[in-house]
Interface confidence: low
């Protein structure tokens, strides 16, 4: 039968920032440069993340914690822990294989990321367009025409700032 170990694993005494070195009688050795261990009892240290290319260092690696990256200007983070960088576009644009392209008429994007989305169809909710949409902004839906019958409190739509679907370049 297999005898259970009554002695505590000596590696469990090794704190974060060290590893249990089997080559040195399980002595707790400091993590080598560019590596870390974030918990105690580790038998190896993990290699630090390198922020390279479009990534830049937000937090340096230490013996107990990994480096953290963000994205160089003109790009933004995606994914857990900024695992990805995506190119920024202007509002009113979306990213395609051939770079940033203006939103097609009838669509908008109010952010520097993501894709152009269709304007809201106010009539589906029985409402009217209060403010026309642009490449950067969705339409604003107002009360339905029936709500604007004589005697009801009227709403004067503000003049659109620019022609629908056109953005200043």
């Amino acid at each position: 039968f297999e005898r259970t170990r009554s002695l505590q694993d000596p590696c469990s005494n090794c704190p974060a920032g060290t590893f249990c070195d089997n080559n040195r009688n399980q002595i707790c050795s400091p993590c080598p440069p560019n590596s870390f261990s974030s918990a105690g009892g580790q038998r190896t240290c993990d290699i630090c993340r390198q922020c390279k290319g479009v990534f830049r260092t937000r937090k340096e690696c230490s013996s107990t914690s990994n480096a953290e990256c963000d994205c160089t200007p003109g790009f933004h983070c995606l994914g857990a822990g900024c695992s990805m960088c995506e190119q920024d576009c202007k509002q009113g644009q979306e990213l395609t294989k051939k770079g940033c392209k203006d939103c097609c008429f009838g669509t908008f994007n109010d952010q520097k990321r993501g894709i152009c989305r269709p304007w809201t169809n106010c009539s589906l909710d029985g409402k009217s367009v209060l403010v026309n949409g642009t490449k950067e902004r969705d339409v604003v839906c107002g009360p339905s025409p029936a709500d604007l019958s004589p005697g009801a409190s009227s709403v004067t739509p503000p003049a659109p700032a620019r022609e629908p679907g056109h953005s200043p370049q």
């Epitope: 995606l78 695992s83 990805m84 960088c85 995506e86 990213l95 395609t96 294989k97 894709i115």
Partner: nanobody, 124 residues
Framework: EVQLLESGGGLVQPGGSLRLSCAAS????????MSWVRQAPGKGLEWVSS????????YYADSVKGRFTISRDNSKNTLYLQMNSLRAEDTAVYYC?????????????????WGQGTTVTVSS
């Protein structure tokens, strides 16, 4: 861990050629579109070329069209960029990039993994 490792950069005279390679690991290479992006000294990142997952569709920036050819060997998990008729303005660090799948169709993409880059210097 997803990794991209570029090689093949170097010093070349104007009019010369270079072939860049990008060895991919840690993901199913044949499932993803790939790109080459470059950064000239003191300038921003510039998209150079993309290739779809199968290798059937390729895309090029106007500045390299007719001179550069992107290709891939899915059996070797490797992306290539054949650069001919090189010019001084092609001097840059060239990055291999894996494209993610955040868009709604093939016309949208993002880059989610970058290599460390390989330097191409075109000078006489």
């Amino acid at each position: 861990e997803v990794q991209l490792l570029e090689s093949g950069g170097g010093l070349v005279q104007p009019g010369g050629s270079l072939r860049l390679s990008c060895a991919a690991s840690g993901f199913t290479f044949s499932n993803y579109a790939m790109s080459w992006v470059r950064q000239a000294p003191g300038k921003g990142l510039e998209w150079v070329s993309s290739i779809d997952a199968s290798g059937g569709d390729t895309y090029y920036a106007d500045s390299v069209k007719g001179r550069f050819t992107i290709s891939r060997d899915n059996s070797k998990n490797t992306l290539y960029l054949q650069m001919n008729s090189l010019r001084a303005e092609d001097t840059a660090v060239y990055y291999c990039a894996k494209e993610g799948s955040h868009g709604t169709d093939d016309s949208h993409y993002d880059v989610d993994v970058w290599g460390q880059g390989t330097t191409v210097t075109v000078s006489s």
